[in-house]
Interface confidence: medium
Amino acid sequence: SPGPVPPSTALRELIEELVNITQNQKAPLCNGSMVWSINLTAGMYCAALESLINVSGCSAIYRTQRILHGLCPHKVSAGQFSSLHVRDTKIEVAQFVKDLLLHLKKLFREGQFN
């Protein structure tokens, strides 16, 4: 079986998928579902997954969830929260994705793949 995907490849794949679901998109993503905001720091892949995994029935983000599963080293299930969540702030999925995308591009440019 193939070995693990290099972090740089997984990050590019995640960026490309986030671009796919946001490009020229004005309709509310996932019917305007709200998710917990996260701190965009170390461990953000797991935190992002913990937030997005609570959105159900939204096919637009299935692939994003799958890529994040590959980037997060531990098992994540719905209802699970880490200290990285800003628990008093909920934002729309579309804004969450846009914030995450901008941060990931910054990481990629700086060569921070892990």
């Epitope: 590019r12 960026i15 490309e16 671009v19 796919n20 946001t22 490009q23 020229n24 998109q25 004005k26 309709a27 846009k98 995308l101 901008l102 591009k105 990629f108 440019r109």
Partner: antibody, heavy 126, light 108 residues
Framework: EVQLVESGGGLVKPGGSLRLSCAAS????????MSWVRQAPGKGLEWVGR??????????NYAAPVKGRFTISRDDSKNTLYLQMNSLKTEDTAVYYC?????????????????WGQGTLVTVSS | SYELTQPPSVSVSPGQTARITCSGD??????AYWYQQKSGQAPVLVIY???KRPSGIPERFSGSSSGTMATLTISGAQVEDEADYYC???????????FGGGTKLTVL
């Protein structure tokens, strides 16, 4: 000043090939999504295709009438966009414009094609 | 393939309001963009993301969108606004661009 300058147009026979270039200046080319748009004489605008920035996957999409015949590429080190046109047909005769599809790509924004070149004329005729 | 539909021509007198429509099935979820093209010149973006006006575009240009219809409105049209106007958007995937057939605006 943001600027796009196309070159490489000219007269070519049906079945022939041509490569157009678009030199960009005044903005961070590597961040930008770039498009080609054409306009046949006396007709409307027609989207030809688009290439994303490398950081956004470098994905290339083509309009159905040119898919398989035209190839879009970019050289970020030279700030240049290319359109390789093969198996040309008389109906490919048009002014070809390059345009920035996303100068704000760095910020995850999409502004539409907000800067255009002056265009280069491609004539396909026997 | 996906299409955007515009009226071929619109005529108004100077000072009147011109409205140009653009219809497409994906417009409820995808933004519309409007371009002005004067004879022999490259297109110029006048409205982006349905309603936003780039810097340098006069305030008389505005855009709106409802359902499958986007509208470009020129309030108090002037003789210099006479041009071809094209709407642009993408198909539902966002991957393929498409222009409307264009509308010739006559201000006489």
């Amino acid at each position: 000043e943001v600027q796009l300058v196309e070159s490489g147009g000219g007269l070519v026979k049906p079945g022939g090939s041509l490569r157009l270039s678009c030199a960009a200046s005044g903005f961070t080319f590597s961040n930008a999504w770039m498009s080609w748009v054409r306009q046949a004489p006396g007709k409307g605008l027609e989207w030809v295709g688009r290439i994303r920035s490398k950081i956004d996957g470098g994905t290339i999409n083509y309009a159905a009438p040119v898919k398989g015949r035209f190839t879009i590429s970019r050289d970020d080190s030279k700030n240049t966009l290319y359109l390789q046109m093969n198996s040309l047909k008389t109906e490919d005769t048009a002014v070809y414009y390059c345009a920035t599809d996303q100068v704000g790509a760095y910020y995850g924004d999409y502004y539409g094609m907000d800067v255009w070149g002056q265009g280069t004329l491609v004539t396909v005729s026997s | 393939s996906y299409e955007l539909t515009q009226p071929p021509s619109v005529s108004v007198s100077p000072g009147q309001t011109a409205r140009i429509t653009c219809s497409g099935d994906a417009l409820p979820e995808k933004y519309a963009y409007w371009y002005q093209q004067k004879s022999g010149q490259a297109p110029v973006l006048v409205i982006y993301e349905d309603t936003k006006r780039p810097s340098g575009i006069p305030e008389r240009f505005s855009g709106s969108s409802s359902g499958t219809m986007a509208t470009l409105t020129i309030s108090g049209a002037q003789v210099e606004d006479e041009a071809d106007y094209y709407c642009y958007s993408t198909d539902s995937s966002g991957n393929h661009g498409v222009f409307g057939g264009g509308t010739k605006l006559t201000v006489l």
